[in-house]
Interface confidence: medium
Amino acid sequence: LECYSCVQKADDGCSPNKMKTVKCAPGVDVCTEAVGAVETIHGQFSLAVRGCGSGLPGKNDRGLDLHGLLAFIQLQQCAQDRCNAKLNLTSRALDPAGNESAYPPNGVECYSCVGLSREACQGTSPPVVSCYNASDHVYKGCFDGNVTLTAANVTVSLPVRGCVQDEFCTRDGVTGPGFTLSGSCCQGSRCNSDLRNKTYFSPRIPPLVRLPPPEPTTVASTTSVTTSTSAPVRPTSTTKPMPAPTSQTPRQGVEHEASRDEEPRLTGGAAGHQDRSNSGQYPAKGGPQQPHNKGC
């Protein structure tokens, strides 16, 4: 089996003129392609992988929401030579959320890493953005975490920082097919320079106090406090999955034109950012990109 191969970390690693082909090892009978896109209220980026896969042919699309950080995942596996060029994997422009200026800053500032490398997203070196409230949601927390995409025996990961709706989440995460978005939230401007070692103690959780020894006649009762390490995914009604690539419209024009519809426009988008002008533009627009004129 021969498959297209590329790796992209918010760059142009899967741009049209960088496409490679690889011959898969014996026994490998699927080509795979995956795109994971993350949208903050200040921009978006995507990770992508193409290559030889494992498992069965099929599609898996999902939309996720982690405290107002939206994630969109598309995974496609197929069993024909070079069939893994249907999704649009390359990174969209990291534009701000279009009508962002329509929202007044809410007073909180956060470090923002949207498509930045790990080196550029260290400590206090990333750019600082002003948070704002959107879609009836309050973005007063700051987030520090990572997004990871695993496909075709390749794992790519990038840091994510920005404004979120929660100020106290600790090591929360959402997962999709081969995809994880996880991290922690904090309260206060520029508090997200490094939350890797954040513990579960926060203003919302009563501190542990040493109770006096119980009186012989009374039983000390302590309130159990549990913290979830996995953020609940929105209900299906509000988490809009990505459309299957097969439902996408074919390219315009004559058969062989197939111009790369480069930057993913995720169609649909989790509810919550609906009045942001870039919602409804994520990720893969632009129909099958597999050569569809073989033998002509």
């Epitope: 490679k20 422009a93 034109e257 790369r260 990109q289």
Partner: antibody, heavy 117, light 111 residues
């Protein structure tokens, strides 16, 4: 029908500037990567620069880096190449080309740039 | 000096089969990047002839075929015709140059 129409070429002195335009039609320009490729008289093809569909990703050949600037206006379906500090070796026919299935699938007819004193 | 190496000329008689080679390196063809071929008829702009190593755009006759192996690629033209007289260029992406590179071109003469 896909069409690419270059304009803006002409005669210019060394050190001068020119701005080339490429008007696109027949396809969704805002979805397409675009490139400039040039061909010196009697010579082969040389890639000059490419730009992603949104303009967020841009690359240049070493021979023009720092002197040429590629840009696009998706609202006008137009690709541009601003050429500064022109040299005699920049004399060529400049083609704009659309990137399709990993390749330049459509080319304009070209515009001639002549740099001479 | 072009990054991809092609013979400067090739020739054949009508009906014959002609092959044009394109030699690259580990930073382009050898790195797995797909190879394309362009045909440039005299006085005209280049036209895509083969993309993705061996795929023909619609409208290109099946007399034209491409192949790739290792750090090299080749274009074969069977049943040569007088209208095939043109310059032929191979192209591929190059890691070290961060952009597409072309061969120097092969002038095909139909005798």
């Amino acid at each position: 029908e896909v069409q690419l129409l270059e304009s803006g070429g002409g005669l210019v002195q060394p050190g001068g500037s020119l701005r080339l335009s490429c008007a696109a039609s027949g396809f969704t320009f805002s979805n397409a990567w675009m490139s400039w490729v040039r061909q010196a008289p009697g010579k082969g093809l040389e890639w000059v620069s490419y730009i992603s569909s949104s303009g967020s990703t841009i690359y240049y050949a070493d021979s023009v880096k720092g002197r040429f600037t590629i840009s696009r206006d998706n609202s006008k379906n137009t690709l541009y190449l601003q050429m500064n500090s022109l040299r005699a070796e920049d004399t060529a026919v400049y083609y704009c080309a659309r990137e399709g299935l990993w390749a330049f699938d459509y080319w304009g007819q070209g515009t001639l740039v002549t740099v001479t004193s | 000096q072009s990054v991809l190496t092609q013979p400067p000329s090739a020739s054949g008689t009508p009906g014959q089969r002609v092959t044009i080679s394109c030699s690259g390196s580990s930073s382009n063809i050898g790195a797995g990047y797909v190879v394309h071929w362009y045909q440039q008829l005299p006085g005209t702009a280049p036209k895509l002839l083969i993309y993705d190593n061996n795929q023909r755009p619609s409208g290109v006759p099946d007399r034209f075929s491409g192949s790739k192996s290792g750090t090299s690629a080749s274009l074969a033209i069977s049943g040569l015709r007088s209208e095939d007289e043109a310059d032929y260029y191979c192209a591929a992406y190059d890691d070290s140059l961060n952009g597409p590179v072309f061969g120097g071109g092969t002038k095909l003469t139909v005798l």
